[in-house]
Amino acid sequence: CKAMHVAQPAVVLASSRGIASFVCEYASPGKATEVRVTVLRQADSQVTEVCAATYMMGNELTFLDDSICTGTSSGNQVNLTIQGLRAMDTGLYICKVELMYPPPYYLGIGNGTQIYVIDPEPCPDSDF
C-alpha cells in the first residue's frame, strides 16, 4: 500500500438549493486505469460514508442510484457534487482516492472540505 497526495478546497458554501461542488485532485504516480473515490463526512466526532464510486479512466463516475453524489473525472481530477444538503449536513467532507488497477495499489486521503449549508428562509406570505 503506497500513500498518495490528495488535494481539495478548504471551504465550500452550498447553494440555496442545497448543492455543493468541489474538486478532488490526486497526484497519480502512474497511469491508473481504475480509480475508486469515496466521500466521508466528519461531524460531531463521527465519520460516516456519504458516497462512493469506482470508475475507469476516461469514463463517467457511477454512483449508486440512490446516492446524493454525482461527479465527473478529468485526468487526475474528480469534480464532485453533493445534493439535497440541509443545515444539519454541515461538516467536513473528506475525499478518499484509491488507485485500484494496475498494481501497485495507491491510497490517499484529502484534508477535507468544510461545507457550510444554510437552510433558506421561507418566503413571507404575500398580501397580494
Partner: nanobody, 126 residues
C-alpha cells in the same frame, strides 16, 4: 512496539449482542488510531470500526453502521467493539490493530495498520 490482546468473542444466536475488548500496552502513544477488523474464512480482512486516540472521533462503515459501535476507556487503555443485532454473516475472527497515521484512521484499509492482536472468534448461529 504495541501489544494488543482481544477478548469477548464466543458463540451467540442471531439477533444477540457481544462486546469485544482490546487491551493495549506498550508504545500506544505513538499510534494515531485503533481499528477493528474481521476476517471470515477465505475472505480478505474487512474494516468494521476505528477510533482516533487524540479526540475519540469514531468511524464505522455503512456495512455495520447502526449495529456496531466503537468506544474507548482511557484509564484502562482498552478499546471496545459493541456488536448488536448480530447476523450469521458477522461470523469471523475479529482483530484489533493500531494505525500509525491519519491515513490509517480514515482509510479503513488493513494495510495501513501495523500492530495486530491475535484475534477473537465470533460465531453467530441462526
Amino acid at each position: 512496539q504495541v501489544q494488543l490482546v482481544e477478548s469477548g468473542g464466543g458463540l451467540v444466536q442471531a439477533g444477540g449482542s457481544l462486546r469485544l475488548s482490546c487491551a493495549a500496552s506498550g508504545r500506544t502513544f505513538s499510534s494515531y488510531a485503533m481499528g477493528w477488523f474481521r476476517q471470515a474464512p477465505g475472505m480478505e480482512r474487512e474494516f468494521v470500526a476505528s477510533i482516533r486516540w487524540s479526540d475519540n472521533t469514531t468511524y464505522v462503515p455503512n456495512s455495520v453502521k447502526g449495529r456496531f459501535t466503537i468506544s474507548r476507556d482511557n484509564a484502562k487503555n482498552t478499546v471496545y467493539l459493541q456488536m448488536n443485532t448480530l447476523k450469521p454473516e458477522d461470523t469471523a475472527v475479529y482483530y484489533c490493530a493500531t494505525g500509525p497515521t491519519r491515513l490509517s484512521f480514515y482509510s479503513g484499509n488493513y494495510r495501513t495498520y501495523d500492530s495486530w492482536g491475535q484475534g477473537t472468534l465470533v460465531t453467530v448461529s441462526s
